[in-house]
Interface confidence: low
């Protein structure tokens, strides 16, 4: 079994906003300009995160919190709380090492972000094209031609479908 | 061309410290994170912390934290990690290794040539 | 954490031989998956970024796929040059964990 602490870690006591200062036997001091502590019986301080280049400051780091950042316009946020920026794209483009491509043929972003995906291939629903996809946009899928009354014009059925290819590197 | 030159090998008595150095060249120092990542004899690898050198916003694996200190001289255009607190376990092949802020899937794409720790008695 | 288990951890193929290797995340991951490649005393070396995307001047017999929780990195064609341990990362949270490892042996 374990046995309980008899005595209490004094530094248990500090709130957040201060840091139990094992330079001045640890006493609760106040955490120093551009840093905080966001819990108690924290023994040092962090860093206040700095919005600097394409960061920009979405809320000011506070004793008890820190800053948060999100980016400048033209790029957006990636990664845990925003750790990173990416560059944005138009729609119809992916970003690649070499900077913004056109979505390959068969696929499309209608986001300024993220990647290029696959046109919806309708006949797997039994379903045909009804307006086209294009960069930008996905297909639209209408009823199956079976479905449509007879006379009614059909849009031309897709060609087969293909393994969509990427936009280079 | 890009490069990430680590400091020699390291041989450190249980309980103290090593500070080693990633000098990096070739590119922008200030736009990519710098990594660190470990790689004990025959294991995995496993990422210990990083910092962007602009501001030197750091983050770091829990596992580390209480024991790793990451810094950077930007006029020489080098990363530091210091581990402290040594154990037999930190016995490692440390390596440097760098992330492009602006272009996430850039992800630890050059690596130092790797710094081996030895802690022994 | 998020926890890659990666599989097997060692395989012996043939040259030639076509050679598959699993990873599978503890959480949805979407595709932030890179696979590295490390030959003894090396410094491991990138060849594949999310989940697919062959990084320039790595050989077309590498391939990569997968999205979600479950990605494969595939040698099309075993070469002698590719004798290596194989690791993914996955990069979607911090920290990024890397699973661990494939030892791939000729036969």
């Known amino acids: 079994f374990e046995r309980t602490r008899s005595l209490q870690d004094p530094c248990s006591n500090c709130p957040a906003g201060t840091f139990c200062d094992n330079n001045r036997n640890q006493i609760c001091s106040p955490c120093p300009p551009n840093s905080f502590s966001s819990a108690g019986g924290q023994r040092t301080c962090d860093i206040c995160r700095q919005c600097k280049g394409v960061f920009r400051t979405r809320k000011e780091c506070s004793s008890t919190s820190n800053a948060e950042c999100d980016c400048t316009p033209g790029f957006h946020c990636l990664g845990a709380g925003c750790s990173m920026c990416e560059q944005d794209c138009k729609q119809g483009q992916e970003l690649t090492k070499k900077g913004c491509k056109d979505c390959c043929f068969g696929t499309f972003n209608d986001q300024k972000r993220g990647i290029c995906r696959p046109w919806t291939n309708c006949s797997l629903d039994g379903k045909s094209v009804l307006v086209n996809g294009t960069k930008e946009r996905d297909v639209v899928c209408g009823p199956s031609p079976a479905d449509l009354s007879p006379g009614a014009s059909s849009v031309t059925p897709p060609a087969p479908a293909r393994e969509p290819g990427h936009s280079p590197q | 061309q890009v490069q990430l030159v680590q400091s020699g090998a390291e041989v450190k008595k249980p309980g103290s410290s090593v500070k080693l150095s990633c000098k990096a060249s070739g590119y922008t120092f200030s736009s990519y994170w710098i990594n660190w990542v470990r790689q004990a004899p025959g294991q995995g690898l496993e990422w210990m912390g990083n910092?962007?050198?602009?501001?030197?916003?750091?983050n770091y694996n829990q596992k580390f934290k209480d024991r790793v200190t990451l810094t950077v001289d930007k006029s020489t255009s080098t990363a530091y990690m210091e581990l402290s607190s040594l154990r037999s376990e930190d016995t490692a092949v440390y390596y440097c290794?760098?992330?492009?802020?602006?272009?996430?899937?850039?992800?630890?794409?050059?690596w130092g040539q790797g710094t081996l720790v030895t802690v022994s008695s | 954490d998020i926890q890659m288990t990666q599989s097997p951890s060692s395989l012996s193929a043939s040259l030639g031989e076509r050679v598959t290797i699993t990873c599978k995340a503890s959480?949805?991951?979407?595709?932030?998956l890179s696979w590295y490649q490390q030959k003894p005393g090396k410094a491991p070396k990138l060849l594949i970024y999310?989940?697919?995307r062959l990084v320039d001047g790595v050989p077309s017999r590498f391939s990569g796929s997968g999205s979600g929780q479950d990605f494969t990195l595939t040698i099309s064609s075993l070469q002698p040059e590719d004798i290596a341990t194989y690791y993914c990362l996955q990069y979607d949270e911090l920290p990024p964990t890397f699973g661990g490892g494939t030892k791939v042996e000729i036969k």
């Open positions: 290794t760098r992330t492009w802020e602006f272009y996430y899937d850039s992800v630890f794409d050059y």
């Open positions: 999310r989940a697919n």
């Open positions: 959480q949805d991951i979407n595709s932030y």
């Open positions: 910092i962007y050198p602009s501001d030197s916003y750091t």
